[in-house]
Protein backbone atom coordinates (compact mmCIF):
# COMPACT_ATOMS: atom_id res chain seq x y z
CA UNK A 1 0.00 0.00 0.00
CA UNK A 2 1.53 3.69 -0.69
CA UNK A 3 3.11 4.14 -3.36
CA UNK A 4 1.01 2.08 -6.35
CA UNK A 5 0.46 4.60 -8.33
CA UNK A 6 3.17 7.17 -8.51
CA UNK A 7 2.33 9.64 -11.21
CA UNK A 8 5.03 12.19 -11.45
CA UNK A 9 3.58 14.85 -12.58
CA UNK A 10 5.73 18.60 -11.54
CA UNK A 11 4.13 21.97 -11.13
CA UNK A 12 6.30 24.76 -9.95
CA UNK A 13 5.69 26.85 -7.27
CA UNK A 14 6.66 30.40 -6.70
CA UNK A 15 7.20 31.38 -3.14
CA UNK A 16 6.85 34.35 -0.77
CA UNK A 17 9.89 34.80 0.66
CA UNK A 18 9.34 37.76 3.22
CA UNK A 19 8.02 36.71 6.67
CA UNK A 20 5.42 34.05 6.85
CA UNK A 21 2.21 35.22 8.16
CA UNK A 22 0.10 32.18 10.28
CA UNK A 23 -1.14 29.33 8.68
CA UNK A 24 -4.90 29.80 8.47
CA UNK A 25 -6.82 27.67 11.50
CA UNK A 26 -8.01 24.81 9.60
CA UNK A 27 -4.53 23.82 8.61
CA UNK A 28 -2.96 23.19 11.85
CA UNK A 29 -2.92 19.42 11.43
CA UNK A 30 -0.42 17.25 9.89
CA UNK A 31 1.54 19.99 7.94
CA UNK A 32 4.61 17.67 6.66
CA UNK A 33 3.45 14.08 5.65
CA UNK A 34 6.32 12.11 6.33
CA UNK A 35 8.62 11.77 9.42
CA UNK A 36 11.83 14.14 9.55
CA UNK A 37 13.52 10.50 10.52
CA UNK A 38 16.64 11.17 8.70
CA UNK A 39 17.92 13.31 11.44
CA UNK A 40 19.62 15.21 8.27
CA UNK A 41 19.41 19.06 7.70
CA UNK A 42 18.10 20.41 4.66
CA UNK A 43 20.53 21.69 1.75
CA UNK A 44 21.84 25.63 1.53
CA UNK A 45 21.70 27.55 -1.31
CA UNK A 46 23.48 30.46 -2.01
CA UNK A 47 21.14 32.55 -3.39
CA UNK A 48 20.05 35.95 -1.66
CA UNK A 49 17.75 37.17 -4.36
CA UNK A 50 14.72 39.02 -3.60
CA UNK A 51 13.34 38.46 -6.63
CA UNK A 52 10.57 35.66 -5.68
CA UNK A 53 10.18 34.47 -9.12
CA UNK A 54 14.01 33.20 -8.89
CA UNK A 55 12.52 30.34 -6.82
CA UNK A 56 10.41 27.46 -7.60
CA UNK A 57 9.21 24.38 -5.64
CA UNK A 58 8.11 20.88 -7.25
CA UNK A 59 4.42 19.64 -6.86
CA UNK A 60 4.20 15.93 -7.82
CA UNK A 61 1.02 13.80 -7.83
CA UNK A 62 0.50 10.73 -6.03
CA UNK A 63 -2.21 8.27 -6.03
CA UNK A 64 -2.78 5.89 -3.32
CA UNK A 65 -5.73 3.70 -1.11
CA UNK A 66 -6.49 4.61 2.17
CA UNK A 67 -6.75 2.08 4.72
CA UNK A 68 -8.09 0.80 8.13
CA UNK A 69 -6.77 -2.62 8.81
CA UNK A 70 -8.23 -4.71 6.25
CA UNK A 71 -10.45 -2.13 4.85
CA UNK A 72 -9.60 -0.29 1.49
CA UNK A 73 -11.39 2.72 -0.15
CA UNK A 74 -13.22 2.23 -2.92
CA UNK A 75 -11.35 4.64 -5.18
CA UNK A 76 -7.91 5.75 -4.52
CA UNK A 77 -7.24 9.54 -3.61
CA UNK A 78 -5.20 11.77 -5.41
CA UNK A 79 -2.82 13.91 -3.30
CA UNK A 80 0.60 16.16 -3.85
CA UNK A 81 3.56 15.32 -2.37
CA UNK A 82 6.03 18.38 -2.23
CA UNK A 83 9.40 17.30 -3.27
CA UNK A 84 11.84 18.06 -0.99
CA UNK A 85 14.00 20.95 -3.25
CA UNK A 86 13.69 24.48 -3.40
CA UNK A 87 15.97 26.76 -5.56
CA UNK A 88 15.87 28.84 -8.54
CA UNK A 89 13.56 27.91 -11.28
CA UNK A 90 16.20 28.15 -13.79
CA UNK A 91 18.58 25.76 -11.71
CA UNK A 92 15.65 23.67 -10.86
CA UNK A 93 15.96 20.33 -12.32
CA UNK A 94 12.36 19.97 -13.19
CA UNK A 95 12.90 18.75 -17.10
CA UNK A 96 15.49 16.62 -18.82
CA UNK A 97 18.52 18.42 -19.53
CA UNK A 98 17.55 21.53 -17.48
CA UNK A 99 20.13 23.15 -15.50
CA UNK A 100 22.05 21.44 -12.94
CA UNK A 101 21.87 21.50 -8.87
CA UNK A 102 23.84 24.30 -6.78
CA UNK A 103 26.78 23.89 -4.16
CA UNK A 104 25.13 23.96 -0.78
CA UNK A 105 25.54 27.29 0.97
CA UNK A 106 23.40 30.05 2.37
CA UNK A 107 19.62 30.14 3.81
CA UNK A 108 17.41 26.82 3.77
CA UNK A 109 14.51 26.87 1.34
CA UNK A 110 11.86 23.79 1.76
CA UNK A 111 9.01 22.38 -0.84
CA UNK A 112 6.50 22.37 2.38
CA UNK A 113 2.63 21.48 2.16
CA UNK A 114 0.68 24.81 2.44
CA UNK A 115 -3.19 24.11 1.49
CA UNK A 116 -5.20 21.04 2.89
CA UNK A 117 -8.29 19.69 1.60
CA UNK A 118 -10.30 17.34 3.81
CA UNK A 119 -12.07 14.35 1.80
CA UNK A 120 -14.01 12.03 2.85
CA UNK A 121 -13.58 8.42 1.86
CA UNK A 122 -15.73 5.19 2.05
CA UNK A 123 -13.71 2.46 3.41
CA UNK A 124 -14.89 -1.30 1.73
CA UNK A 125 -14.10 -4.04 4.79
CA UNK A 126 -13.63 -8.08 4.06
CA UNK A 127 -16.32 -10.40 5.43
CA UNK A 128 -19.47 -8.57 4.72
CA UNK A 129 -18.60 -5.91 6.97
CA UNK A 130 -20.05 -2.36 6.72
CA UNK A 131 -18.09 0.06 4.69
CA UNK A 132 -16.61 2.37 6.85
CA UNK A 133 -16.31 6.52 6.70
CA UNK A 134 -13.27 8.16 7.61
CA UNK A 135 -12.11 11.75 6.69
CA UNK A 136 -8.31 11.99 5.34
CA UNK A 137 -6.43 15.49 4.88
CA UNK A 138 -4.44 15.80 2.24
CA UNK A 139 -1.90 17.88 0.74
CA UNK A 140 -3.51 20.53 -2.02
CA UNK A 141 -0.47 22.42 -2.86
CA UNK A 142 2.94 23.22 -1.87
CA UNK A 143 5.27 25.87 -1.11
CA UNK A 144 9.10 27.19 -1.11
CA UNK A 145 9.31 28.34 2.60
CA UNK A 146 12.62 30.30 3.67
CA UNK A 147 13.72 28.78 6.89
CA UNK A 148 16.30 30.87 9.12
CA UNK A 149 18.64 29.42 11.30
CA UNK A 150 16.30 30.83 13.75
CA UNK A 151 13.51 28.52 12.31
CA UNK A 152 15.98 25.63 12.52
CA UNK A 153 16.43 25.84 16.16
CA UNK A 154 12.26 26.03 15.89
CA UNK A 155 12.01 27.08 19.20
CA UNK A 156 10.38 30.35 18.89
CA UNK A 157 8.50 30.30 15.36
CA UNK A 158 5.13 29.14 15.60
CA UNK A 159 4.03 27.20 12.40
CA UNK A 160 0.66 25.97 13.49
CA UNK A 161 0.21 23.49 16.49
CA UNK A 162 -1.73 20.16 16.93
CA UNK A 163 -2.78 19.03 20.89
CA UNK A 164 -1.60 15.73 20.31
CA UNK A 165 0.89 15.07 17.35
CA UNK A 166 1.77 11.43 17.58
CA UNK A 167 5.72 10.60 17.42
CA UNK A 168 6.46 7.15 15.75
CA UNK A 169 9.08 5.21 16.99
CA UNK A 170 10.67 5.75 20.91
CA UNK A 171 12.47 8.34 20.93
CA UNK A 172 11.05 10.99 23.19
CA UNK A 173 10.78 14.50 22.62
CA UNK A 174 12.00 16.40 25.04
CA UNK A 175 9.67 17.59 28.07
CA UNK A 176 11.09 21.22 27.95
CA UNK A 177 10.40 21.62 23.92
CA UNK A 178 7.05 22.65 22.64
CA UNK A 179 4.66 20.97 20.06
CA UNK A 180 4.90 24.12 17.83
CA UNK A 181 8.96 23.52 17.85
CA UNK A 182 8.17 19.70 17.21
CA UNK A 183 6.25 21.48 14.18
CA UNK A 184 9.23 23.29 13.09
CA UNK A 185 11.48 20.79 13.29
CA UNK A 186 9.06 18.35 10.77
CA UNK A 187 8.65 21.43 8.21
CA UNK A 188 12.67 22.01 8.12
CA UNK A 189 12.88 18.37 7.31
CA UNK A 190 10.37 17.78 4.82
CA UNK B 1 -3.84 26.55 20.06
CA UNK B 2 -6.18 23.74 19.07
CA UNK B 3 -8.71 23.36 21.36
CA UNK B 4 -12.21 22.19 22.14
CA UNK B 5 -13.90 23.89 24.44
CA UNK B 6 -17.26 23.14 25.89
CA UNK B 7 -20.05 24.54 27.66
CA UNK B 8 -20.75 24.75 31.20
CA UNK B 9 -22.11 22.14 34.01
CA UNK B 10 -26.11 21.22 33.38
CA UNK B 11 -28.12 20.54 36.33
CA UNK B 12 -31.69 19.53 34.70
CA UNK B 13 -34.50 17.46 36.15
CA UNK B 14 -35.70 13.78 35.14
CA UNK B 15 -37.44 13.83 31.65
CA UNK B 16 -36.13 17.15 30.55
CA UNK B 17 -34.03 17.58 27.67
CA UNK B 18 -30.31 19.18 27.97
CA UNK B 19 -28.10 20.66 24.53
CA UNK B 20 -24.32 20.49 25.11
CA UNK B 21 -21.49 23.05 23.09
CA UNK B 22 -18.13 22.07 21.72
CA UNK B 23 -16.58 24.87 20.07
CA UNK B 24 -13.45 24.43 18.26
CA UNK B 25 -10.59 26.98 18.16
CA UNK B 26 -7.21 26.88 15.90
CA UNK B 27 -9.43 24.27 13.09
CA UNK B 28 -12.26 24.21 10.99
CA UNK B 29 -14.66 21.29 12.26
CA UNK B 30 -15.68 20.62 8.31
CA UNK B 31 -12.18 18.91 7.97
CA UNK B 32 -13.26 16.66 11.03
CA UNK B 33 -15.44 14.26 12.31
CA UNK B 34 -16.18 15.22 15.87
CA UNK B 35 -17.31 12.40 18.21
CA UNK B 36 -19.16 12.18 22.00
CA UNK B 37 -18.28 10.29 24.82
CA UNK B 38 -19.73 10.20 27.90
CA UNK B 39 -17.65 8.98 31.27
CA UNK B 40 -20.09 8.61 34.74
CA UNK B 41 -18.19 8.82 37.61
CA UNK B 42 -15.53 6.59 38.80
CA UNK B 43 -16.34 4.76 35.02
CA UNK B 44 -14.78 3.89 31.72
CA UNK B 45 -15.69 5.72 28.66
CA UNK B 46 -18.87 5.11 26.46
CA UNK B 47 -18.78 6.61 22.67
CA UNK B 48 -22.06 8.03 21.70
CA UNK B 49 -21.69 8.99 18.15
CA UNK B 50 -20.05 11.12 15.60
CA UNK B 51 -20.59 13.82 12.99
CA UNK B 52 -19.76 14.87 9.56
CA UNK B 53 -19.96 18.69 10.39
CA UNK B 54 -19.72 19.94 6.87
CA UNK B 55 -22.90 17.98 5.65
CA UNK B 56 -24.29 16.32 9.37
CA UNK B 57 -24.06 13.18 8.13
CA UNK B 58 -24.19 11.38 11.60
CA UNK B 59 -23.76 7.47 13.44
CA UNK B 60 -24.70 6.75 16.69
CA UNK B 61 -23.86 4.15 19.51
CA UNK B 62 -26.98 1.48 19.27
CA UNK B 63 -27.56 2.43 22.62
CA UNK B 64 -27.89 6.04 22.09
CA UNK B 65 -29.94 5.85 19.17
CA UNK B 66 -33.09 8.04 20.63
CA UNK B 67 -31.11 9.30 23.30
CA UNK B 68 -28.75 11.54 21.96
CA UNK B 69 -28.82 14.04 18.92
CA UNK B 70 -25.64 15.36 17.41
CA UNK B 71 -25.74 18.63 15.63
CA UNK B 72 -22.88 20.80 13.99
CA UNK B 73 -22.58 24.60 12.81
CA UNK B 74 -20.10 25.37 10.51
CA UNK B 75 -20.82 28.89 10.95
CA UNK B 76 -19.64 29.06 14.78
CA UNK B 77 -17.31 26.23 14.43
CA UNK B 78 -19.35 24.42 17.17
CA UNK B 79 -20.61 21.26 17.84
CA UNK B 80 -23.43 20.02 20.02
CA UNK B 81 -25.31 17.41 21.80
CA UNK B 82 -28.53 16.89 22.64
CA UNK B 83 -29.82 14.35 25.02
CA UNK B 84 -33.24 14.08 25.86
CA UNK B 85 -35.87 12.28 28.39
CA UNK B 86 -33.42 12.59 30.98
CA UNK B 87 -32.37 9.69 34.17
CA UNK B 88 -29.91 9.72 36.57
CA UNK B 89 -28.26 7.18 34.39
CA UNK B 90 -27.48 10.27 32.11
CA UNK B 91 -25.76 11.97 35.35
CA UNK B 92 -22.02 12.08 33.54
CA UNK B 93 -19.55 14.34 31.59
CA UNK B 94 -19.48 14.42 28.41
CA UNK B 95 -16.69 14.69 26.23
CA UNK B 96 -16.27 16.05 22.57
CA UNK B 97 -13.58 14.81 20.61
CA UNK B 98 -11.62 15.39 16.84
CA UNK B 99 -11.15 12.14 14.97
CA UNK B 100 -7.70 12.47 14.18
CA UNK B 101 -5.90 12.04 10.98
CA UNK B 102 -1.86 10.89 10.05
CA UNK B 103 -0.76 9.53 7.00
CA UNK B 104 3.11 8.25 6.77
CA UNK B 105 3.26 4.97 4.47
CA UNK B 106 -0.38 4.08 6.40
CA UNK B 107 -3.44 5.84 7.17
CA UNK B 108 -4.53 6.66 11.25
CA UNK B 109 -6.87 7.37 12.88
CA UNK B 110 -7.35 8.51 16.73
CA UNK B 111 -8.93 10.92 18.90
CA UNK B 112 -5.94 13.67 19.32
CA UNK B 113 -8.09 16.72 20.75
CA UNK B 114 -10.62 16.45 23.20
CA UNK B 115 -12.83 19.06 24.53
CA UNK B 116 -12.82 20.23 28.54
CA UNK B 117 -16.13 17.98 29.33
CA UNK B 118 -19.30 19.21 30.77
CA UNK B 119 -20.95 17.90 33.65
CA UNK B 120 -24.65 16.61 33.46
CA UNK B 121 -26.37 15.80 36.81
CA UNK B 122 -29.88 15.01 36.51
CA UNK B 123 -32.23 15.02 39.50
CA UNK B 124 -34.98 16.69 40.94
CA UNK C 1 -19.94 -5.18 19.50
CA UNK C 2 -16.64 -5.89 20.54
CA UNK C 3 -15.93 -5.91 24.17
CA UNK C 4 -12.91 -4.60 25.63
CA UNK C 5 -11.53 -6.16 28.88
CA UNK C 6 -8.77 -4.82 30.54
CA UNK C 7 -6.57 -6.17 33.62
CA UNK C 8 -6.32 -5.55 36.28
CA UNK C 9 -8.68 -3.04 36.89
CA UNK C 10 -6.54 -1.42 39.44
CA UNK C 11 -2.76 -1.93 39.86
CA UNK C 12 -0.11 0.10 41.77
CA UNK C 13 3.61 -0.08 41.07
CA UNK C 14 6.80 1.66 42.95
CA UNK C 15 8.98 3.55 41.08
CA UNK C 16 11.33 2.38 38.70
CA UNK C 17 9.49 -0.95 38.67
CA UNK C 18 7.93 -2.31 35.30
CA UNK C 19 4.64 -2.15 34.58
CA UNK C 20 2.50 -4.28 32.29
CA UNK C 21 -1.42 -3.93 31.99
CA UNK C 22 -3.21 -5.69 28.91
CA UNK C 23 -6.73 -5.63 27.06
CA UNK C 24 -8.26 -8.22 25.98
CA UNK C 25 -10.91 -7.85 22.88
CA UNK C 26 -13.81 -10.51 22.40
CA UNK C 27 -12.88 -10.52 18.88
CA UNK C 28 -10.00 -9.78 16.40
CA UNK C 29 -9.23 -6.06 16.07
CA UNK C 30 -6.64 -4.51 13.96
CA UNK C 31 -5.19 -1.98 16.32
CA UNK C 32 -6.00 -0.85 19.55
CA UNK C 33 -5.12 2.68 20.88
CA UNK C 34 -4.58 3.93 24.24
CA UNK C 35 -5.77 6.89 26.48
CA UNK C 36 -4.27 8.36 29.41
CA UNK C 37 -6.66 10.03 32.12
CA UNK C 38 -5.78 11.57 35.42
CA UNK C 39 -8.57 13.24 38.14
CA UNK C 40 -10.37 15.44 36.58
CA UNK C 41 -9.18 16.41 33.86
CA UNK C 42 -9.85 14.93 29.63
CA UNK C 43 -8.30 11.51 28.50
CA UNK C 44 -5.40 12.51 26.54
CA UNK C 45 -3.76 9.88 23.29
CA UNK C 46 -1.05 7.77 25.01
CA UNK C 47 -0.44 5.29 22.36
CA UNK C 48 -2.35 5.04 18.81
CA UNK C 49 -2.20 1.88 16.61
CA UNK C 50 -1.11 -0.80 18.82
CA UNK C 51 2.59 0.83 19.12
CA UNK C 52 3.02 4.47 18.52
CA UNK C 53 3.46 6.85 21.28
CA UNK C 54 1.91 10.63 21.13
CA UNK C 55 3.79 13.33 21.68
CA UNK C 56 5.19 13.88 24.55
CA UNK C 57 4.61 10.14 25.98
CA UNK C 58 8.09 9.47 27.15
CA UNK C 59 9.87 6.36 25.99
CA UNK C 60 9.46 4.64 29.04
CA UNK C 61 5.84 3.85 27.26
CA UNK C 62 5.48 1.11 24.73
CA UNK C 63 2.02 -0.77 23.45
CA UNK C 64 2.06 -3.88 21.37
CA UNK C 65 -0.04 -6.93 20.74
CA UNK C 66 -2.43 -7.87 17.74
CA UNK C 67 -5.66 -10.12 17.40
CA UNK C 68 -7.46 -9.94 20.83
CA UNK C 69 -4.30 -9.50 22.91
CA UNK C 70 -2.82 -5.86 23.39
CA UNK C 71 -0.68 -4.23 26.03
CA UNK C 72 1.02 -1.88 27.59
CA UNK C 73 3.85 -0.93 29.20
CA UNK C 74 5.86 1.41 31.44
CA UNK C 75 9.61 -0.04 31.64
CA UNK C 76 10.08 2.16 34.48
CA UNK C 77 7.49 3.38 36.85
CA UNK C 78 7.50 6.94 37.56
CA UNK C 79 4.93 9.01 39.84
CA UNK C 80 3.54 10.75 36.87
CA UNK C 81 2.59 7.99 35.25
CA UNK C 82 -0.27 7.45 37.88
CA UNK C 83 -3.52 7.67 35.46
CA UNK C 84 -6.06 5.19 34.30
CA UNK C 85 -5.79 4.37 31.14
CA UNK C 86 -7.68 2.98 28.66
CA UNK C 87 -7.54 0.61 25.89
CA UNK C 88 -10.06 1.80 22.48
CA UNK C 89 -10.74 -0.11 19.48
CA UNK C 90 -12.85 0.75 16.26
CA UNK C 91 -11.96 -2.45 14.31
CA UNK C 92 -15.95 -3.08 14.06
CA UNK C 93 -18.80 -0.82 14.73
CA UNK C 94 -19.61 0.63 16.98
CA UNK C 95 -16.34 2.43 18.75
CA UNK C 96 -15.79 1.10 22.17
CA UNK C 97 -13.43 1.77 25.60
CA UNK C 98 -12.13 -0.54 27.75
CA UNK C 99 -13.14 0.19 31.35
CA UNK C 100 -9.67 1.20 32.50
CA UNK C 101 -6.65 0.31 34.41
CA UNK C 102 -6.09 2.33 37.23
CA UNK C 103 -2.64 2.41 37.77
CA UNK C 104 -1.28 4.11 41.55
CA UNK C 105 2.19 4.62 42.66
CA UNK C 106 3.14 2.77 45.82
Known amino acids: QGWQAFKNDATEIIPELGEYPEPPPELENNKTMNRAENGGRPPHHPFETKDVSEYSCRELHFTRYVTDGPCRSAKPVTELVCSGQCGPARLLPNAIGRGKWWRPSGPDFRCIPDRYRAQRVQLLCPGGEAPRARKVRLVASCKCKRLTRFHNQSELKDFGTEAARPQKGRKPRPRARSAKANQAELENAY | EVQLQQSGAEHVKPGASVKLSCTASDFNIKDYYIHWVKQRTAQGLEWIGR????????EYAPRFQGKATIIADTSSNTAYLQLSSLTSEDTAVYYC?????????????????WGTGTTVTVSS | EIVLTQSPALMSASPGEKVTMTCSAS?????MHWFQQKPGTSPKLWIY???NLASGVPARFSGSGSGTSYSLTISSMEAEDAATYYCQQWSSNPLTFGAGTKLELK
Open chain 2, 97 to 113: AREGYYYDSRDYWYFDV
Open chain 3, 49 to 51: STS
Open chain 3, 27 to 31: SSVSY
Open chain 2, 51 to 58: IDPEDGET
